[in-house]
Amino acid sequence: ILEAHYTNLKCRCSGVISTVVGLNIIDRIQVTPPGNGCPKTEVVIWTKMKKVICVNPRAKWLQRLLRHVQSKSLSSTPQAPVSKRRAA
């Protein structure tokens, strides 16, 4: 499920984690492209253990995970909803 939202006028991620986050523990993923005062793409993940973390948008594991989630969403109910925030 891809949703369009508006973002705040600044970056939210002051640092990113480098470890892999398994799909089985992910509740939501949010991808925010550059814009509105933040010059970088930000990826925020909410986990089922009630954590919210920023991850490196260029991490290969994340790219694979996003492709997996988006392909699932085309064929069935996604395991982890993806919300894509769009800059104004």
Partner: antibody
């Protein structure tokens, strides 16, 4: 404006059950990412995390007290509750409820109630 | 459980002094550490989050840093309104654990 306020008995006897209520405004526990936690502080001592409850009814407890704690909520009344069974003198403390919101940046316990002093005495 | 060892337990300093207090984590907590300020008779309030980020409305004389498993809160020039207890909290994993607190007094 986010506010929280604790209520409950000021004094109770050993072996009784302590029932605390946190009544809050300015946010809803039906909103994705919202949570309420309970923390206590014996007089002149440090803080101790007790439990958290989240919008989806997920609950987390301090393992050292897990057999005595029950956290719950009433979403429509904007309230969270904590029960501690079989209280004793070491449970004498100021009890706080505090809000957590799973946003980035994540700052757990960003708003606190004023606290309620609870004394366990025979 | 992750243990947070906070030191010193009390600290007395003069106005204008630079002071530092520390918390040591028994396991890796990354940057997931908050410093709370608690003024006498009041509830705690976050002053530093994610180890080094200043919370909203907090004066710039407050700063946070990390060296390995040691996390520090520094006040660059002490003011009278800084007299309070300070608590660190790790939120890397449950159960969340606090340090034992540092009482900051003005000489």
């Amino acid at each position: 404006q986010v506010t929280l306020k604790e209520s409950g008995p000021g004094i109770l006897q050993p072996s009784q059950t302590l029932s605390l209520t946190c009544t809050f405004s300015g946010f809803s526990l039906s909103t994705y990412g919202m949570g309420v936690g309970w923390i206590r502080q014996p007089s002149g001592k440090g803080l101790e995390w007790l439990a958290n409850i989240w919008w989806d009814d997920d609950k987390y407890y301090n393992p050292s007290l897990i057999n005595r704690l029950t956290i719950s909520k009433n979403t429509s009344n904007n309230q969270a509750f904590l029960k501690i069974t079989n209280v004793d003198a070491p449970d004498t403390a100021t009890y706080y409820c505090a809000r957590s919101e799973l946003v980035m940046p994540y700052v757990p316990f960003d708003f606190w109630g004023q606290g309620i002093m609870v004394t366990v005495s025979s | 459980d992750i243990q947070m060892t906070q030191s010193p337990s009390s600290l007395s300093a003069s106005l204008g002094d630079r002071i530092t207090m520390t918390c040591q984590a028994s396991q890796d907590i990354g940057i997931e550490l908050i410093w709370f300020q608690q003024k006498p008779g009041k509830s705690p309030w976050p002053v530093i989050y994610y180890t080094a980020n200043l919370a909203s409305g907090v004066p710039s004389r407050f700063s946070g840093s990390r060296s390995g498993s040691h996390y520090s809160l520094t006040i660059s020039s002490l003011e009278s309104e800084d007299m309070a207890d300070y608590h660190c909290l790790q939120y890397k994993q449950y159960p969340f654990t606090f340090g034992s607190g540092t009482k900051l007094e003005i000489k």
